[in-house]
């Protein structure tokens, strides 16, 4: 503790100049105070002045008033300062005194002379308000008032709290009357060393170091971190926990980047070909007779959809071509014959009809030839039947369709679901995406098709605490908790209170 | 192919200032959050600002705030970086980066120079 | 600020060679910590993610390791292109902090 005892002189009378041992002074009492405040004593006894001692300089000769005076000698009111905690009693001994010598220190002077003496004995509380009295002998009077206050930094009843005001790493406080601390605005806690942290701020994700602030913890975002962040990898998706990867419509593949709709945002297929979703680039174009190349950017030659009929030989020229016939055909396709049955003009066993009374004729094929001489080997073939990049076998009679993976139907139209197959293994989810089937792997496994098991699975130990969800991530020795609402920790080890640095990603 | 091109830099005296554009390309951009990462010459990395990608929460390296501000764009692609005050030593090359302060920075640009000097 | 403190700040290898980069955090980082490749006028380029997680593209001989303050990048098996600077980063206390770099020179 640590205090000040104040004593304020007011006012001391010696109309008639006298000692107390019945002396006079010569010329006059040239008066000074010496005061004693010790411990309370029932009866007061000469011995150290335990609680502090002062003198004063001389103040004024017989009778005079004393005037305030802040500063240097003669400083009233006198400062008794005492540094342990004020036990509420006390003993006080004003002594007033007589010196022949030095105004200003009259303590050293041989020959001083005792005028009068007071003892007070009794209690005294803490406080600002002075307590005033005044005391008579025969020969002097002396009015005065003194009061107990505490020093700078200490409050109390016994000015034994020590409180000192501060703005810093260490707290954020004022000190009220009694002591106690009194927060700045934005900060608590017992010695208002913890912000309060921006209205709303996520209790788990955000923490704050000074007041109206949310920091994110790692993998969550925004003014109130209550919005994840996507996955480092992640092209195109969002996320409902952080790193995670879900893909925007149009996206598919573990970071989003596999385009499901290539076709709509790209326009690969040039010439008026079909583009399709599917392939090994995401997309495979369907060309229209007369093109080719990948995206059938490349123009065939004009003869090569075999224009010339009847065995007519073709000639590309700039823009068109030129069907050269044999004897018996004109026309530009070679198309009219000359021919009559009687030149037998069928092959292959094909039965001629005469038309337009005998100066034209027709052929009947037999089963797998066609041309207007049934010259031509049906080739089943030539219109694309199969969709979806199937393949087009001839037969004999027929034609079959060789599917591509994931195509079935008589042309391959059906599209069968890649995840009909079950092809991921040990219980791992399937999606069918455009390129394929892609598997989530529970716990412990990963590959493609969740065939490989992973020799240490972070979540296999159970790291999580309270009930918390464990996921594993892209990389099997990394493990995230998602704690359940109250708890926080990278394990959700913490209930929510505790000191908010400890973010929740393993 | 995820691509941030950086733009706007260049000599500027002392008190100056400048705007840094990036542009994105290769991912969807409004769903991310986006930093601007500076180096001054023969240097290590230095964050500089963040703008998060719900709700344009920013915040700053102590040495910048109230002179730099972050901003983005989602229907442009872009994210830009205004720079008023310019001290000397704000010369750097200044590089987008696609992330937050809490967590990697996984695409960079190329980066742009910019020279405080008088 | 959490102070990040990267050594060597420089050193020679070999192609061939298995190399080690330590990386000191000044308080517990819980793992948050990214290392990055910068070559001469190129922009820095991510390896790992949260202390051990390699970076979509980026070929195994790169690793990383460590716990509470202390991190490690591993290269098993220097190749030419390897020969870099390269920065630790932690994203764990705001504001995120990068080490000084280390300068890995052919031999």
């Known amino acids: 503790g640590s205090g000040i005892f104040q004593l304020r002189l007011q006012e001391f009378v010696n109309q008639r100049g006298m000692l107390a041992n019945g002396q006079s002074c010569e010329p006059g009492c040239r008066t000074f105070f010496r005061i004693c405040l010790k411990h309370f004593q029932a009866t007061f006894s000469e011995g150290p002045c335990t609680f502090g001692n002062v003198s004063t300089p001389v103040l004024g000769t017989n009778s005079f008033v004393v005037r305030d005076k802040n500063s240097g000698s003669g400083r009233n009111p006198l400062q008794l300062p005492f540094n342990f905690t004020w036990p509420g009693t006390f003993s006080l001994n004003i002594q007033a005194w007589h010196t022949p010598g030095d105004d200003l220190r009259p303590e050293t002077s041989p020959g001083n002379s005792l005028i009068s003496q007071i003892i007070i004995q009794g209690s005294l509380a803490v406080g600002k308000i002075w307590r005033t009295d005044e005391q008579n002998d025969t020969l002097t009077r002396l009015s005065y008032s003194y009061r107990v206050i505490c020093s700078d930094n200490y409050y109390g009843e016994s000015c034994s709290r020590l409180c000192k005001k501060r703005d810093d790493h260490f707290g954020h406080y004022e000190c009220q009357p009694d002591g106690s601390l009194s927060c700045l605005p934005g900060w608590t806690g017992k010695y208002c060393d913890q912000p309060i942290c921006l209205s709303g701020c996520h209790e788990q994700n955000g923490y704050c170091s000074k007041p109206d602030e949310c920091i994110c913890r790692p993998g969550w975002q925004g003014r109130l971190c209550n919005e994840c962040i996507p996955h480092n990898g992640c092209r195109h998706g969002t996320c409902s926990i952080p790193w995670q990867c879900a893909c925007d419509e149009g996206w598919g593949g573990l970071f989003c980047d596999q385009d499901l709709n290539y076709c709509t945002h790209h326009s690969p297929c040039k010439n008026g070909s079909t583009c399709s979703n599917s392939g090994p680039k995401g997309y495979t174009c369907t060309c229209l007779p007369g093109y080719t190349g990948e995206h059938c950017e490349l123009g065939l030659s004009k003869c090569a959809s075999n224009p010339c009929r009847n065995g007519g030989s073709c000639k590309d020229q700039e823009n068109s071509y030129h069907c050269l016939c044999p004897p018996g055909y004109y026309g530009q396709h070679c198309e009219h014959s000359t021919l009559t049955c009687a030149d037998s003009p069928c092959f292959n066993g094909g039965s001629c009809r005469e038309r337009n009374q005998g100066s034209s004729y027709a052929c009947e094929c037999p089963p797998n030839f066609t041309g207007s001489n049934c010259e031509k080997k049906v080739d089943r073939c030539t219109s694309n039947p199969c969709a979806n990049g199937g393949q087009c076998q001839n037969r004999g009679p027929s034609r079959t369709c060789r599917c591509r993976p994931g195509f079935t139907g008589t042309h391959c139209e059906l599209h069968i679901s890649d995840c009909a197959r079950s092809p991921c293994a040990h219980g791992g989810t399937c999606h069918d995406l455009e390129n394929g089937p892609v598997c989530t792997c529970p716990a412990g496994f990963s590959g493609r098709r969740c065939e490989v098991r992973i020799t240490h699975d972070a979540c296999a130990s159970g790291p999580c605490f309270n009930g918390a969800t464990c996921y594993t991530g892209l990389s099997p020795n990394n493990f995230v908790c998602n704690c359940p609402y109250g708890f926080v920790g990278s394990r959700c080890e913490f209930p929510v209170g505790l000191p908010p640095s400890f973010p929740w990603v393993a | 192919e995820v691509q941030l091109v950086e733009s706007g830099g260049g000599l500027v005296q002392p008190g100056g200032s400048l705007r840094l554009s990036c542009a994105a390309s290769g991912f969807t951009f409004s769903n991310f959050p986006m930093a601007w990462v500076r180096q001054a010459p023969g240097k290590g990395l230095e964050w500089v600002a963040t703008i998060s990608s719900s709700d344009g929460t920013t915040y700053y390296r102590d040495s910048v705030k109230g002179r730099f501000t972050i901003s983005r764009d989602n229907a442009k692609n872009s994210l830009y970086l205004q720079m008023n005050s310019l001290r000397a030593e704000d010369t750097a090359v200044y590089y987008c980066a696609r992330g937050y302060y809490n967590s990697p920075f996984a695409y960079w640009g190329q980066g742009t120079l910019v020279t405080v000097s008088s | 600020d959490i102070q990040m403190t990267q050594s060597p700040s420089s050193l020679s290898a070999s192609v061939g060679d298995r190399v080690t980069i330590t990386c000191r955090a000044s308080e517990d980082i819980y793992s948050n910590l990214a290392w990055y490749q910068q070559k001469p006028g190129k922009s820095p380029k991510l390896l790992i993610f949260?202390?051990?997680n390699l970076a979509d593209g980026v070929p195994s001989r790169f690793s990383g390791s460590g716990s509470g303050t202390d991190s490690t990048l591993t290269i098993s098996s220097l190749q030419p292109e390897d020969f870099a600077t390269y920065f630790c980063?932690?994203?764990?206390?705001?504001?995120?902090?990068f080490g000084q770099g280390t300068k890995l020179e052919i031999k």
């Open positions: 949260d202390t051990n």
């Open positions: 980063q932690q994203y764990n206390n705001y504001p995120p902090t």
